[in-house]
Amino acid sequence: FNISGCSTKKLLWTYSTRSEEEFVLFCDLPEPQKSHFCHRNRLSPKQVPEHLPFMGSNDLSDVQWYQQPSNGDPLEDIRKSYPHIIQDKCTLHFLTPGVNNSGSYICRPKMIKSPYDVACCVKMILEVKPQTNASCEYSASHKQDLLLGSTGSISCPSLSCQSDAQSPAVTWYKNGKLLSVERSNRIVVDEVYDYHQGTYVCDYTQSDTVSSWTVRAVVQVRTIVGDTKLKPDILDPVEDTLEVELGKPLTISCKARFGFERVFNPVIKWYIKDSDLEWEVSVPEAKSIKSTLKDEIIERNIILEKVTQRDLRRKFVCFVQNSIGNTTQSVQLKEKRG
């Protein structure tokens, strides 16, 4: 299809080499007080095309994205050629930064309702650069946390080193939807709730004498509870003795609940005590069996191929630890009678 009639937008993604970050392109970027237009060709090519409003973003769940190769080759379907780019409804997600993402991206609805239609389309010229500005050492992260129930703020990473006074007008989106009330480089959240979690996009316009382009950054915002003040507790085993059959295989499970910590380094391990000796056992990897906002339950098993008489004289100890402290639970094996 002919892309010369597409509305064009220039975007700049300046990524930090220090952090993992994502980027997004919206198919129908709903700018305030302005709708996109598309051309509909009438029978006579000499006629001035009639401007029709572009479909609202609600209608755009079924769109096709293409990349325009710089060598003039035909348009390439994004889904077939670019595994690090994911399409979600009308949004294109770039999972990894890199200058190789620079280029022209075109989107249009899959359904063209009339043979006279030249599909509404948007062409986005994306320039991707690594951040070179070392003067801003403490720029806001692309991953930001908000503490539930408290006051917090979401900062636009590309503008966080500028004061509010010198900051340009910013356009904010959450999960692809425009937040038209928010216009500064920081959204102040007076009271943090679960619905504040999500993917935020901040845009501002930068211009030089020749052209203007949109500088965009993506922020993943997570709502969290305060760090736990408690050491982990062991949910299983509860009893300190366990009846077993000699010669049979045995699996003992250790399940522990760890409270939320922003920097989470849980330890869960098994060791064996035999008279004065103590050694850690090589056991299968720990696995998370339940994760909520407030805590996580982690399980780690010790597997004995067959229970021996020697095992009955040993203590099997599960040890769990977080930044607050540690807890242990020991199990003594006892031969089943009868």
Partner: nanobody, 120 residues
Framework: DVPLQESGGGLVQAGGSLRLSCVAS????????VGWFRQAPGKEREGLSC????????LYADSVKGRFTISSDNAKNTVYLQMNSLKPEDTAVYLC?????????????WGQGTQVTVSS
């Protein structure tokens, strides 16, 4: 006079739908945002969704995104929460609250709540 009044709760089978209403009296919807919250026994209050009627912007918690839809009718001074594909874990008291300014503001007034029970 209660500034916010919820209705529409009830007992529903898993997979079913309910539509909750929150009528605001004493202030106009275009001056505030309204949030829907829920409280289950022994759990923290959870912020589900919020709508800023002045610009129509909406926010959703991950737990309800794609299943619940918030909307408002300024003429009726009412905010709705359409709940589809309900699950037993959605059982709770559902409350609406007035939020100062936009959805990033502070809650100022709360309704009494309406009970939603989802049976399996």
């Amino acid at each position: 006079d209660v500034p916010l009044q919820e209705s529409g709760g009830g007992l529903v089978q898993a997979g079913g739908s309910l539509r909750l209403s929150c009528v605001a009296s004493g202030f106009a919807l275009d001056e505030i945002a309204v949030g829907w919250f829920r409280q289950a026994p022994g759990k923290e209050r959870e912020g589900l969704s919020c709508i800023s009627s002045s610009d129509g912007s909406t926010l959703y918690a991950d737990s309800v995104k794609g299943r619940f839809t918030i909307s408002s009718d300024n003429a009726k001074n009412t905010v709705y929460l359409q709940m589809n594909s309900l699950k037993p874990e959605d059982t709770a008291v559902y409350l609406c609250a007035a939020v100062r300014g936009s959805c990033f503001g502070r809650t100022t007034h709360w309704g009494q709540g309406t009970q939603v029970t989802v049976s399996s």
